[in-house]
Interface confidence: medium
């Protein structure tokens, strides 16, 4: 099925272009998306492209500018927030990124009625995160590991909590590891609805071991960076919860929300809050052993001042063939009598579906059911449950929005957006008002995204917000490639596949192939989304094939392909992609002399121990920032899925499933190793040892560091990257430069 | 204006109980948390007991815990402070006073009315 | 708890004089203090809050600064009428605590 042809006609040929690598390292065929700032049930806020802050009524279609440019340049502001009250615009400015979503930054508060900046008890700087309330103007932040209360934003600053300490005690925001592989959020704190409590964590990673890597700067001496980081079986940190009552924060105190007495008897995780109504907390705990997670529904006592979680209030939720829930244990959604709610978990046929819990877990509702799953509820009102899922045509890279009526009995199923665009868009998410009076329906794909506004109750189209035009007519003299997402059938297992064809493909003649690996536990690549990237001009340019292959372990095909890999990574994702590249070769097109694959993060272990196969499939490959033993990976991820590294649990696996392990098995192959040394994620540490390996067994091999870079090896890096990738893949494929 | 009026206090025996009672006035005094603080002859103040607007949160000082409870009567516009188990340690002028707001501050105070725990 | 306390115990000043009070609490409390005058037999009176606000009613003789652990009272001229104990009291942690007080009298 060729999702996006090229628009190539002989007629035209001599006006088409390749694209070159130039155009994707400079962002040259980026597209932009439209999300509306909800700050009602008919009205939104945008930053216009000349940088004001625009407040557009749907309903009496009339629009006008908050906040000028003028005002956000007056302090370099680069983000914005406006309080519920509309009396105040926080400006945020001197954005320092931390880790992959927390950043410090300086807030100033604007105050509309008088069109002032808010003079006397400013905020500190940095501050590690800050928000309004729900309603009003309270500010909470957190500053120096320690969380402040104001009432109003020209107030003095109420402290919380006294205890927090750099790297060791964290409150309101999570430590690395919660931020990264729980809570995936910079902030750790949540306003009760109407904003009478605030609820917080707080991390104590005093007794976790330092991850310590040098980082090299400008200075005579390098400097180094220190970061309480949990591997496999290492020490956790300690989690608590904690609410304090906003109105009397010094009187009464913060009050600690009890953990469930299955969760606290042994090491646990506390995962997610969602407060319910202003005195009902929802609070998730997962075992540290993952395969149970308790939800406990906590209820303020006012005669004590306590939170009281009783045990009729606790569900469990377990799994017998894996590890509980997908990536994340999912959320409830309450409904309005604010005890039942909606959650997605597996049903008895092993899909994640959607499921109504009003007593018991055991007498849940199951709402949604089929070979297919839904992934996201968005949103539920009195009489609607908006959805996403893969059920549409069985492809389960798509993404649609249903819409389920819960007030009629039976509830019917509508897809929303199914039809709308049905060649253009088969990947949306979306994003709801107040009551869901209004929506904006945000497609990725597989044709050029586009961003629209829809009546919540006919589902009609009001407007296109964002169409990308510019962008389509940049692309008419572009040689695009052909993609197409196809499933191969091996051995009871379905691997569904994209591939990428060069603009002028012709299945007589032999190409290259090169295989895009990420392969995690619960992800997806083959998605119908757009995309003109590294890949897209390796096909477009240079003839190459590339595939993406979801194979066992990856998601949103039922728990029989997620869980097949549990207790057992490295193994059948290897295989997988393997078992593809052979049925590749069948198809006749392939040049079976010049396969490669490559993959960063998990895929740079996918792919470097698909390079160690033995297999003599690939010629050679790329691993960008690969993982290379369990053992050094962040604990919380890593025993999701692969239990501990004790004898008596997993340890023989984690050192089988090694890179190092199969050090002698690279001989046969081109290896280009690269690795970020500032890198807090998968620690450079990973690739030092493969390279430490492969030099013991005096296998040749390439490789690249990048100085002070972590994960993501952005900025120059990043070009500097594709361009060395490029050149290596060239001549491994033997093609001109 | 605003005017706290305490009453009920006077000498009682160590382990007796007392009544203390705060009637308010020119203000809307269930938009107000309340407290009790006292001050021993010739030394300085110590704070006693709080009570929220609505009456359902309080917090008393460690040396009153369990001994004293506050409440109030919105209706009437009336705080209480009952004493059980009086100690010679807890003879010291009370005074009512109406909190500051988010501030945590005291605004306004009674006269106060005199403890006297005394054998 | 949080301890205050209060230099000097005592001062002796003249009418006119710039009387400077100083507190100090046992950890940081933001800008979370108060302070109050009381005459004797009278009951305690709020002249600042939140570490510089005035109170409403107060003479602007009377001013506060300070933030974290150190603050001070400042009477700019002393009158005849403000001859009295002062008092501080820390707000920001469970249970509020005043300083010993401050006698002021006439030299």
């Known amino acids: 099925i060729v999702l996006r042809p090229s628009r190539v006609h002989n007629s035209e040929e001599n006006t088409m272009r390749a694209l070159t690598l130039k155009d994707i390292l400079n962002g040259t065929f980026s597209y932009k998306t439209f999300f509306p700032n909800w700050i009602s049930g008919q009205e939104y806020l945008h930053q216009s492209a000349d940088n004001n802050i625009v407040l557009y009524n749907i309903e009496t279609g009339q629009s006008y500018t908050i906040l000028s440019n003028r005002t956000m340049k007056s302090v370099n502001a680069s983000n914005y927030g406006l309080s519920p009250d509309r009396q105040f615009v926080y400006l945020e400015s001197d954005y320092s990124k931390l880790w992959r979503y927390s950043y410090t930054a300086t807030y100033y508060i604007y105050d509309l009625s008088n069109g002032e900046f808010v003079r006397g008890n400013e905020l500190p700087r940095p501050i590690q995160y800050l928000c309004w309330s729900p309603v009003g103007s309270k500010l909470a932040y957190v500053y120096q590991n320690n969380i402040y209360l104001k009432q109003r934003p020209g107030d003095p600053p109420f402290q919380i909590t006294f205890n927090g300490r750099e790297n060791k005690i964290f409150n309101g925001i999570p430590d690395w590891v919660y931020e990264e592989e729980m809570l995936a959020t910079k902030y750790a704190l949540w306003w009760s609805p109407n904003g009478k409590f605030l609820a917080y964590a707080e991390f104590n990673d005093t007794d976790i071991p330092v991850i310590a890597y040098s980082y090299y700067g400008d200075e005579q001496y390098p400097r180094t960076i220190n970061i309480p980081y949990p591997k496999a079986g290492a020490k956790n940190p300690v989690v608590r919860i904690f609410i304090i009552d906003t109105t009397y924060p010094a009187y009464v105190g913060p009050q600690e929300v009890p953990v469930p007495a299955m969760i606290a008897s042994s090491d646990y995780y506390f995962s997610w809050l969602t407060w319910v109504t202003d005195e009902r907390v929802c609070l998730q705990w997962l075992k540290r052993v993952q395969n149970v997670s308790v939800l406990s529904i906590c209820d303020f006592r006012e005669d004590w001042q306590t939170w009281d979680c009783p045990k009729t209030q606790e569900h469990i939720e377990e799994s017998r063939t894996g590890w509980a829930g997908g990536f994340f244990v999912s959320t409830p959604v309450f409904s309005y009598d604010a005890i039942s709610y909606y959650k997605i978990f597996s049903d008895k046929d092993g899909y994640k579906h959607i499921h109504y819990i009003k007593d018991t877990v055991e007498n849940a509702i199951q709402i949604t059911s089929g070979k297919w799953e839904a992934i996201n509820i968005f949103r539920v009102t009195q009489d609607s449950l908006f959805y996403s899922s893969n059920e549409f045509e069985e492809y389960p890279g798509r993404r649609n929005i249903y819409r389920i009526s819960i007030g009629s009995y039976p509830p019917s199923k509508k897809c929303v957006t199914c039809h709308l665009r049905k060649e253009r868009c088969q990947y949306y998410t979306a994003s709801f008002s107040d009551y869901a009076k209004y929506y904006a329906l945000v497609c990725y794909g597989p044709g050029i995204p586009i961003s629209t506004l829809h009546d919540g109750r006919t589902d009609q189209e009001i407007k296109i917000l964002e169409e990308n035009k510019e962008l389509e007519n940049a692309l008419k003299n572009i040689q695009l490639p052909k993609e197409e997402i196809k499933k191969l059938e091996v051995d009871e297992i379905t691997l569904w596949y994209k591939m990428i064809l060069p603009p002028q493909f012709d299945r007589s003649k032999k190409y290259p192939l090169l295989i895009q690996v990420y392969g995690g536990p619960c992800s997806q690549s083959v998605r119908s989304v757009f995309a003109v990237n590294w890949i897209s001009y390796l096909a477009s340019k240079e003839g190459m094939v590339i595939a993406l292959v979801d194979g066992r372990g990856t998601a949103f095909q039922g728990d029989k392909l997620l869980y097949a890999v549990y207790r057992k990574l490295g193994v059948y994702e290897v295989e997988d992609q393997i078992t593809a590249v052979r049925k590749f070769i069948e198809m006749g097109f392939i040049d079976e002399k010049r396969i490669a694959i490559w993959g960063w993060s998990y895929g740079g272990y996918v792919s470097s121990l698909a390079l160690a196969s033995g297999t003599g499939l690939f010629k050679c490959g790329i691993a960008v920032a690969p993982v290379s033993s369990w053992e050094y990976y962040a604990s919380v991820y890593t025993e999701r899925f692969m239990g501990l590294p004790t004898k008596d649990d997993n340890l023989e696996h984690y050192k089988n499933s090694t890179v190092m392990a199969r050090a002698e098995y690279f001989r046969n192959v081109d290896y280009l190793l690269i690795h970020g040394t500032a890198d807090d994620n998968v620690h450079f540490q990973n690739s030092a040892q493969i390279a430490k390996a492969l030099v013991n067994a005096q296998v040749d091999f390439q490789a690249m560091w990048y100085s002070d870079q972590n994960h993501g090896l952005s900025g120059l890096s990043t070009n500097h990257l594709y361009t060395h990738m490029t050149h290596f893949l060239k001549q491994c494929f033997s093609l001109s430069d | 204006q605003v005017q706290l009026l305490e009453s009920g206090g006077g000498v009682v025996q160590p382990g007796r109980s007392l009544r203390l009672s705060c009637a308010a006035s020119?203000?809307?005094?269930?938009?107000?948390?309340m407290h009790w603080v006292r001050q021993a002859p010739g030394k300085g103040l110590e704070w006693v007991a709080f009570?929220?607007?609505?009456?359902?949160?309080?917090s008393y000082a460690d040396s009153v815990r369990g001994r004293f409870t506050i409440s109030r009567d919105n209706s009437k516009n009336t705080l209480y402070l009952q004493m059980n188990s009086l100690r010679a340690e807890d003879t010291a002028v009370y005074y009512c006073?109406?909190?500051?707001?988010?501030?945590?501050?005291?605004?306004?105070w009674g006269q106060g009315t005199l403890v006297t725990v005394s054998a | 708890d949080i301890v205050m306390t209060q230099s000097p115990s005592s001062v002796s000043a003249s009418v006119g004089d710039r009387v400077t009070i100083t507190c100090r609490a046992s950890?940081?409390?933001?800008?979370?203090l108060a302070w109050y005058q009381q005459k004797p037999g009278k009951a305690p009176k709020l002249l600042i809050y939140a570490a510089s606000s005035l109170q409403s009613g107060v003479p602007s003789r009377f001013s506060g600064s300070g933030s974290g652990t150190d603050f001070t009272l400042t009477i700019s001229s002393l009158q005849p009428e403000d001859f009295a104990t002062y008092y501080c009291?820390?707000?920001?942690?469970?249970?509020?605590?005043f300083g010993p007080g401050t006698k002021v009298d006439i030299k």
């Open positions: 950890q940081g409390i933001s800008s979370w």
């Open positions: 009570i929220s607007h609505d009456g359902n949160r309080n």
């Open positions: 006073a109406r909190d500051l707001g988010y501030y945590n501050g005291f605004s306004y």
């Open positions: 009291q820390q707000a920001n942690s469970f249970p509020p605590t």
């Open positions: 020119g203000f809307t005094f269930s938009s107000y948390a």
